[in-house]
């Protein structure tokens, strides 16, 4: 599998992974004890036909061209968890692995 | 996990799974011996904020609102394989499970 990595200076218009630091403090999300911020990344860019397609299915839908199918969009194709310490709804402190918090790769699907 | 199912008569505008039969014969993909057609399904519809979001990450990116982030799009969130019989590039007949050929659920990511 393969995905493009970009930064704020990139001129790449195609689907790409960009750096993004999520700052829980800035959001006012005080129930999150740690981390206060983390590198989440995000996906952005155009999905020209076949570029970075994750699934053969994406290609097949393009071929079949059904009503209302909008074509592939740039979305996470590989994600990873982070460990977090936070208060749950019952005000208990929880330490756990939260899935799909970091984008490792972007693709068209 | 939850996803909407629609059909061609549905008036649903939100992200939904629609039926789609992929016909390899109609594509002229004769290297595929079997099946000649299969139910693939596809995703289509709007992703209003928070509706059917697969990852907490999607919500966080929306909050952070970085340059160029287009918002979530309606994309497969659960897929399954099918068994296929086909010729490979060396003209050998291969029987195998091909991943991500059927959309089981759609969501916003």
């Amino acid at each position: 599998d393969f995905g493009l990595d970009c930064d704020e200076h990139s001129t790449e218009s195609r689907c790409c992974r960009y750096p993004l630091t999520v700052d829980f403090e800035a959001f006012g999300w005080d129930w999150i004890i740690a981390p206060k911020r983390y590198k989440a990344n995000y996906c952005s860019g155009e999905c020209e036909f076949v570029f970075l397609q994750k699934y053969p299915h994406t290609h097949l839908v393009h071929q079949a061209n059904p009503r209302g199918s909008a074509g592939p969009c740039c979305t996470p194709t590989k994600m990873s968890p982070i460990n977090m310490l936070y208060f749950n709804g019952k005000e208990q402190i929880i330490y756990g692995k939260i899935p799909a918090m970091v984008v490792d790769r972007c693709g068209c699907s | 996990d939850f996803g909407l199912d629609c059909d061609e008569h549905s008036t649903e505008s939100r992200c939904c799974r629609y039926p789609l039969t992929v016909d390899f014969e109609a594509f002229g993909w004769d290297w595929i011996i079997a099946p000649k057609r299969y139910k693939a399904n596809y995703c289509s519809g709007e992703c209003e904020f928070v509706f059917l979001q697969k990852y907490p990450h999607t919500h966080l990116v929306h909050q952070a609102n970085p340059r160029g982030s287009a918002g979530p799009c309606c994309t497969p969130t659960k897929m399954s394989p099918i068994n296929m019989l086909y010729f490979n590039g060396k003209e050998q007949i291969i029987y195998g499970k091909i991943p991500a050929m059927v959309v089981d659920r759609c969501g916003c990511s």
């Epitope: - | 004769d30 099918i82 010729f87």
Partner: antibody, heavy 124, light 107 residues
Framework: QVQLVQSGAEVKKPGASVKISCKAS????????MHWVRQAPGQGLEWIGN????????NYNQRFKAKATLTVDKSTSTAYMELRSLRSDDTAVYYC?????????????????WGQGTLVTVSS | DIQMTQSPSSLSASVGDRVTITCKAS??????LSWFQQKPGKAPKSLIY???RLVDGVPSKFSGSGSGQDYTLTISSLQPEDFATYYC?????????FGQGTKLEIK
């Protein structure tokens, strides 16, 4: 509808060759295996071999490897079988049949359509 | 090659009878067995595939059963049009091999 129409009866002398045809209609010819089967007078059925028209990949019964050659003409949706070095015991009706997959496993198929048969008579 | 032994080689029966034809493979063929009907001067016609599945358009008086090496074709109530020769075919392994046939005649 799906149809296989074979060429007419042939009479040949021993040592000669013959090429019989099977013209397909009503389906995508290139995407289905074509099989050939023979039946000597008053005898049972024998499998000769098959061919996949898309890429001409073929598979033969060893017994017929030196006897039969399977080819296709995609432009006319026609399968051919050439029989060489004919002998009197090659006198038989030769059938083409389409292999139809009901599933995806390598053996998940049956013959759904047969040609009407071509009688080849080898006589001096 | 897999040998297919069909029995009986001929069979006399009356209209309305129930008849059974058997086919024995020289090894396990994993239910990859088909049955055909052939009338004089005509091409074979597929009846049953995968041991017990009826081909579309074939009347339900025909049924197939069996597994491993042993298979049967049953015709539940013979009609005049059913008198013909019946063949089995194994498609588990190349080369494909047929049984020698069972000729079903009117008694």
């Amino acid at each position: 509808q799906v149809q296989l129409v074979q060429s007419g009866a042939e009479v040949k002398k021993p040592g000669a060759s013959v090429k019989i045809s099977c013209k397909a209609s009503g389906y995508s010819f290139t995407g289905y295996f074509m099989h050939w089967v023979r039946q000597a007078p008053g005898q049972g059925l024998e499998w000769i071999g098959n061919i996949y028209p898309y890429n001409s990949v073929s598979n033969y019964n060893q017994r017929f490897k030196a006897k039969a050659t399977l080819t296709v003409d995609k432009s006319t949706s026609t399968a051919y079988m050439e029989l060489r070095s004919l002998r009197s015991d090659d006198t038989a009706v030769y059938y083409c049949a389409r292999r139809y997959y009901y599933g995806t496993g390598p053996a998940d198929w049956y013959y759904d359509v047969w040609g009407q048969g071509t009688l080849v008579t080898v006589s001096s | 090659d897999i040998q297919m032994t069909q029995s009986p080689s001929s069979l006399s029966a009356s209209v309305g009878d129930r008849v059974t034809i058997t086919c024995k493979a020289s090894q396990d063929i994993n239910s990859y067995l088909s049955w055909f009907q052939q009338k004089p001067g005509k091409a074979p016609k597929s009846l049953i595939y995968r041991a017990n599945r009826l081909v579309d358009g074939v009347p339900s008086k025909f049924s197939g059963s069996g597994s491993g090496q042993d298979y049967t074709l049953t015709i539940s109530s013979l009609q005049p049009e059913d008198f013909a020769t019946y063949y089995c075919l194994q498609s588990d392994e190349f080369p494909l091999t047929f049984g020698q046939g069972t000729k079903l005649e009117i008694k």
